[in-house]
């Protein structure tokens, strides 16, 4: 049995079922249109 609040995640996806979005750190904001 385990109850945890975990720690902040900062990794990108690693396995097919990691459930993580890519979240690339080098992405830049670009205004649409």
């Amino acid at each position: 049995s385990e109850t945890t609040t975990g720690t902040s995640s900062n990794s990108s996806q690693s396995t097919s079922n990691s459930g993580l979005a890519p979240n690339p750190t080098n992405a830049t904001t670009k205004a649409a249109g």
Partner: antibody, heavy 117, light 113 residues
Framework: DVQLKESGPALVKPTQTLTLTCTVT?????????WHWIRQPPGKALEWMGY???????RYNPSLKTRLTISRDTSKNQFVLTMTNMDPVDTATYFC??????????WGQGTTVTVSS | DIVMTQSPLSLPVTPGEPASISCRSS????????????LTWYLQKPGQSPQLLIS???TRASGVPDRFSGSGSGTDFTLKISRVEAEDVGVYYC?????????FGGGTKLEIK
Amino acid sequence: DVQLKESGPALVKPTQTLTLTCTVTGYSITSGYTWHWIRQPPGKALEWMGYIQYTGSTRYNPSLKTRLTISRDTSKNQFVLTMTNMDPVDTATYFCARGTTASFDYWGQGTTVTVSS
Amino acid sequence: DIVMTQSPLSLPVTPGEPASISCRSSQSLLYSSDQKNYLTWYLQKPGQSPQLLISWASTRASGVPDRFSGSGSGTDFTLKISRVEAEDVGVYYCQQYFIYPLTFGGGTKLEIK
């Protein structure tokens, strides 16, 4: 089949703490994926709140981070949303969902929470 | 945060006719590492939770009829229904599943004329 079901109080008072539980059947929350909370104010769009990954790591929406904790009870295959200092603007339907690397593929039915004195 | 903008807000359609919903993101959703667009479509039928329709901009989820199709890349995306049926009514949401915080569009309500 994977199923998720939310449970918790329908009514909370302002300044109180909300605790909602998502019970997952058909898949172990420690085996894979991310496990999310999403909310929807009446007549409005969806807002992503945060997740706990199968590893136990968490991530929160910065707009809610100071008030939010997502934890889990692996013995019951549940993950839990705790939100402090509730306000009437937090009135919404709260959904739990499973996150893949591209989408939310399974959703709970949702539970409506009203914040009122 | 990435802003997702949908249009139109409301879409009245005659059964059997096509329908098209637009979604624009404030930032490109094309991931250079895998050349996939991390754009997802959901349908929320009245009184229900959202259900997954399309992921990676154009990949239909299991059990989704082939009258639904998704297209687009970068910042501009489209969901098309080739022939609308009565069961298609509800609110359609696009979502970026690319960068945290994950964000949704404001929704497009499809109704039958």
